[in-house]
C-alpha cells in the first residue's frame, strides 16, 4: 500500500458587492492549509443580482432583499453544504448607498436592515452589511489587484530564501456613482485624509487614495445630461439620430445634479432631447465637470483635492475597462496612448446613431453613452489625475486577474477574515518541495 495525499480542504468566503447600478456576489475559495500565502485566494464563482442596485429600492426596502435571493440560493449550491456554517458572508455597499445616506438616511438604514434580515436567514456565517467609505473602497481595490498579482510577497534564492520588496500597482476604479484612485507613494500626504498606512506580510506601505463621489460613470452621465438641458437644448455627446424624452424629476433627483437643478422646475415635466454628435462641444461639456481654479496644497488633481504625482504602473478596472474595451473591441480603435484614447473618443463622438447601431448590432440603448464615457475617461486620466504619455504607458485596463474579478470585494474579505497578516509568514512557500 502507499499513502494517497488527500486534496487540501478548501475554505470559502462570500462578498456581496452592492454597487450603485447593480449588485454582484463573489464566492472566494482557498486551501485551508495555505491561508496566509499571497495569491492563494481565488474566485470560485460569481452571480449578478437581477435589477438595480440596492439604493434603487429606497421606497421598497424589502425589494432590495428579495432581489438577492436568487444569488444566495446559488451560493447554497456553490459552497459545499458542510462548509456553509464556516463560510463568512459580507455585504458591502458603495457610492449609491453613500448618496442615499446623504439624502435619505432613514431609507438607507431601512434598506440595510432589510438586506440584513434576509442574509441572516441563510446558513452562512453572516458578518454584517454596511456602507464602505470611499477610502475603504479605494484601498481594498488596491489590495485586491496587488494580492492577485502577488506583489506583496515573493521569494528568491541567493544562498538563502529572502523576500525582495516588489513594486506595487496603483489601482483606478470607475464605478456607477464614484471613482477611486489609489497608489503607493513615498512622500507623506499633505492631506491626512488621503493617506493610508498598511502593514502587510511584514512590509510597510504608504498609500495615497481618494474617492470622488458623483464622478462614477452613471452620475457623470446624469450630470452631463443636466448640463446639456441647461446650456444647449441638445446633447453634444449623444449621437445624431438619438432622440429621447426626459422626465426632469429623473435628471434632478440625484444629489449629484443638485447644483444644476433649476430653481422652480416641474419634476413631472417632460423634455425632448436629441443628440448632435459634436465631439468638441462634448469635450467642453465634460471639461465642465472638473475644476482646476483653486488648490490649497502644493499640487492637486481637481476640485482642490490633494494628489501626489502619479507614480508606477496602474491597473484600471470596472467601467474604465468597459469603456476602453468598447473602444478596442467593438469599435476596433487603438488606445495604447493618451493621444489614441483621445482620437478614439472623438471617433465615437462623430458617429451617428445609425452608424453606431450598424457597428454594434442590436438595439443597445447604452451605446449612446459611450462617447461621453470615453471623453470622461480620457479627461479624467489626462487632466484630472495628471497622466502624461509616459505614465499612461504604465496603465493596464483589466477586468480580471488570475480568473478573479478586480474590485474592492476580495480585498475587503481578505482584510475582514485576516487572510493577509501584518507579520511575515514562515518560509513555507519557499521550502515546499511537493
Amino acid at each position: 500500500t502507499r499513502d494517497v495525499r488527500e486534496p487540501p480542504a478548501l475554505k470559502y468566503g462570500i462578498v456581496l458587492d452592492a454597487g450603485s447600478s447593480h449588485t454582484s456576489m463573489f464566492i472566494y475559495k482557498w486551501p485551508a492549509d495555505k491561508e496566509n500565502d499571497t495569491g492563494i485566494v481565488g474566485q470560485h464563482s460569481s452571480c449578478d443580482v437581477p435589477g438595480g442596485g440596492i439604493s434603487s429600492y429606497a421606497d421598497n426596502p424589502s425589494g432590495a432583499s428579495q432581489s438577492l435571493v436568487g444569488c444566495l440560493e446559488q451560493a447554497l449550491q456553490d459552497v459545499p453544504k458542510e462548509r456553509h456554517a464556516g463560510t463568512p458572508l459580507y455585504l458591502g455597499a458603495t457610492a449609491g448607498m453613500r448618496l442615499l445616506n446623504l439624502t435619505n438616511p432613514e431609507a438607507s438604514t431601512s434598506v440595510l436592515m432589510a438586506v440584513t434580515h434576509t442574509l441572516t436567514q441563510y446558513p452562512f456565517d453572516f458578518r454584517g452589511a454596511r456602507i464602505l467609505s470611499g477610502q475603504e473602497e479605494g484601498v481594498f481595490g488596491w489590495v485586491t489587484a496587488n494580492y492577485l498579482l502577488e506583489n506583496f510577497i515573493k521569494y528568491g534564492w541567493v544562498g538563502r530564501w529572502f523576500r525582495p520588496r516588489k513594486g506595487t500597482l496603483g489601482a483606478m476604479d470607475l464605478g456607477g456613482a464614484s471613482t477611486q484612485i489609489t497608489f503607493e507613494t513615498t512622500s507623506p500626504a499633505e492631506d491626512r485624509a488621503s493617506e493610508v498606512q498598511l502593514h502587510l506580510y511584514g512590509q510597510h506601505y504608504r498609500v495615497y487614495t481618494h474617492s470622488f463621489l458623483c464622478y462614477g460613470r452613471d452620475q457623470v452621465l446624469q450630470r452631463l445630461l443636466a448640463s446639456a438641458l441647461q446650456t444647449h437644448g441638445f446633447h453634444p455627446c449623444w449621437p445624431r439620430g438619438f432622440s429621447t424624452q426626459v422626465l426632469l424629476g429623473d435628471v434632478y433627483q440625484s444629489p449629484c445634479t443638485m447644483a444644476q437643478r433649476p430653481q422652480n422646475f416641474n419634476s413631472s415635466a417632460r423634455v425632448s432631447l436629441s443628440g448632435s454628435s459634436d465631439p468638441h462641444l462634448c469635450r467642453d461639456l465634460v471639461s465642465g465637470l472638473f475644476s482646476f481654479s483653486s488648490c490649497p496644497f502644493s499640487r492637486c488633481s481637481f476640485n482642490g483635492v490633494f494628489q501626489p504625482p502619479v507614480a508606477g504602473n496602474f491597473v484600471a478596472f470596472s467601467a474604465f475597462f468597459a469603456t476602453v474595451d468598447f473602444l478596442r473591441t467593438s469599435m476596433g480603435l487603438p488606445v495604447a496612448t493618451l493621444q489614441q484614447l483621445e482620437a478614439a473618443a472623438v471617433n465615437v463622438c462623430n458617429q451617428t446613431w445609425a452608424q453606431l447601431q450598424a457597428r454594434v448590432p442590436g438595439q443597445r440603448a447604452r451605446l449612446a453613452d459611450y462617447c461621453a464615457g470615453a471623453m470622461f475617461v480620457q479627461q479624467l486620466l489626462s487632466r484630472g489625475y495628471g497622466f502624461d504619455e509616459r505614465a499612461f504607458g504604465g496603465v493596464i485596463f483589466q477586468k480580471k486577474a488570475a480568473d478573479t474579478a478586480v474590485g474592492w470585494a476580495l480585498g475587503y474579505m481578505l482584510n475582514l477574515t485576516n487572510l493577509i497578516p501584518a507579520d511575515p509568514p514562515g518560509l513555507r512557500k519557499g521550502t515546499d518541495f511537493s
Partner: antibody, heavy 124, light 111 residues
Framework: EVKLEQSGPGLVKPSQSLSLTCSVT?????????WNWIRQFPGNKLEWMSY???????NYNPSLKNRISITRDTSKNQFFLKLSSVTTEDTATYYC?????????????????WGQGTSVTVSA | DIKMTQSPASLAVSLGQRATISCKAS??????????MNWYQQKPGQPPKLLIY???NLESGIPARFSGSGSGTDFTLNIHPVEEEDAATYYC?????????FGGGTKLELK
C-alpha cells in the same frame, strides 16, 4: 399634443403595393423621435415593421427589408409606408406610432403616440 | 429575433381581485443591469397604450394598481385591484435588441 392620423386604401390586390400615409400634428417630425409602422394581424399578433428617424435614417425589420420602404415629406409633416408584392399574409391593421428613448439612467425605447389604425385587406 | 411568449392567453378575474400576466423572452432582455421590457394595454378598436417601461416603471397617468416586475427572461404584469376599465388585451414588448418584438397578448376579461 402629438397626434397621428392615418390614411390609405383598405383593400389591396395581391402582388400590388400597399401605400399608407401618417400625418403628424402637434410636433415636427424633424425635431425628434422615431416614426414607426407596426401592424397587427387578425389573430392580434403585433409586428414592428420599420421607423424613419427625425433625421431621416431608416430602420427596417429584417423579415420585411426587401419589400418595405419608409419615406417622409417634411413640408407636410407626413411619413409614408410602402410595402410591395403583398400577399394575403399581409392582411392586418396597420398603425403608425411615434417612439423615442425614455430616459431613466438607461434609455428605454417606447412607442407612446399612436395613430388610429388602418385595416388593410389583401384580396383579389 | 427575440421571441416573447405570454401566458395565459386569456384570463377572467373578478372585480377587486388580482390579475397576473407572465411574459417569457427567448433570451435575456437585460443589459448593463437594466431590463428593456415594456407593457402595453389595448382595448377593442383602439391602438395599444404604453403602461410600463423598463420592466417596472409606471408611465405617467397610469394608475398605481398596475405594476411590473422581473428581469432577464421572466417578467410579470400585475393588476390589483382589477377594475372594470381594465378589461383589455395586454402585450409585453422587448426593446433590448432590434427588431423590437411583442408577446402574443393576454386577454383580460371580468367575471
Amino acid at each position: 399634443e402629438v397626434k397621428l392620423e392615418q390614411s390609405g386604401p383598405g383593400l389591396v390586390k395581391p402582388s400590388q403595393s400597399l401605400s399608407l400615409t401618417c400625418s403628424v400634428t402637434g410636433y415636427s417630425i424633424t425635431s425628434g423621435y422615431y416614426w414607426n409602422w407596426i401592424r397587427q394581424f387578425p389573430g392580434n399578433k403585433l409586428e414592428w415593421m420599420s421607423y424613419i428617424s427625425y433625421d431621416g435614417d431608416n430602420n427596417y425589420n429584417p423579415s420585411l427589408k426587401n419589400r418595405i420602404s419608409i419615406t417622409r415629406d417634411t413640408s407636410k409633416n407626413q411619413f409614408f409606408l410602402k410595402l410591395s408584392s403583398v400577399t394575403t399574409e399581409d392582411t392586418a391593421t396597420y398603425y403608425c406610432a411615434g417612439g423615442y428613448y425614455r430616459y431613466g439612467l438607461s434609455y428605454y425605447y417606447v412607442m407612446d403616440y399612436w395613430g388610429q389604425g388602418t385595416s388593410v385587406t389583401v384580396s383579389a | 429575433d427575440i421571441k416573447m411568449t405570454q401566458s395565459p392567453a386569456s384570463l377572467a378575474v373578478s372585480l377587486g381581485q388580482r390579475a397576473t400576466i407572465s411574459c417569457k423572452a427567448s433570451q435575456s432582455v437585460d443589459y448593463d443591469g437594466n431590463s428593456y421590457m415594456n407593457w402595453y394595454q389595448q382595448k377593442p378598436g383602439q391602438p395599444p397604450k404604453l403602461l410600463i417601461y423598463a420592466a417596472s416603471n409606471l408611465e405617467s397617468g397610469i394608475p398605481a394598481r398596475f405594476s411590473g416586475s422581473g428581469s432577464g427572461t421572466d417578467f410579470t404584469l400585475n393588476i390589483h385591484p382589477v377594475e372594470e376599465e381594465d378589461a383589455a388585451t395586454y402585450y409585453c414588448q422587448q426593446s433590448n435588441e432590434d427588431p423590437p418584438t411583442f408577446g402574443g397578448g393576454t386577454k383580460l376579461e371580468l367575471k
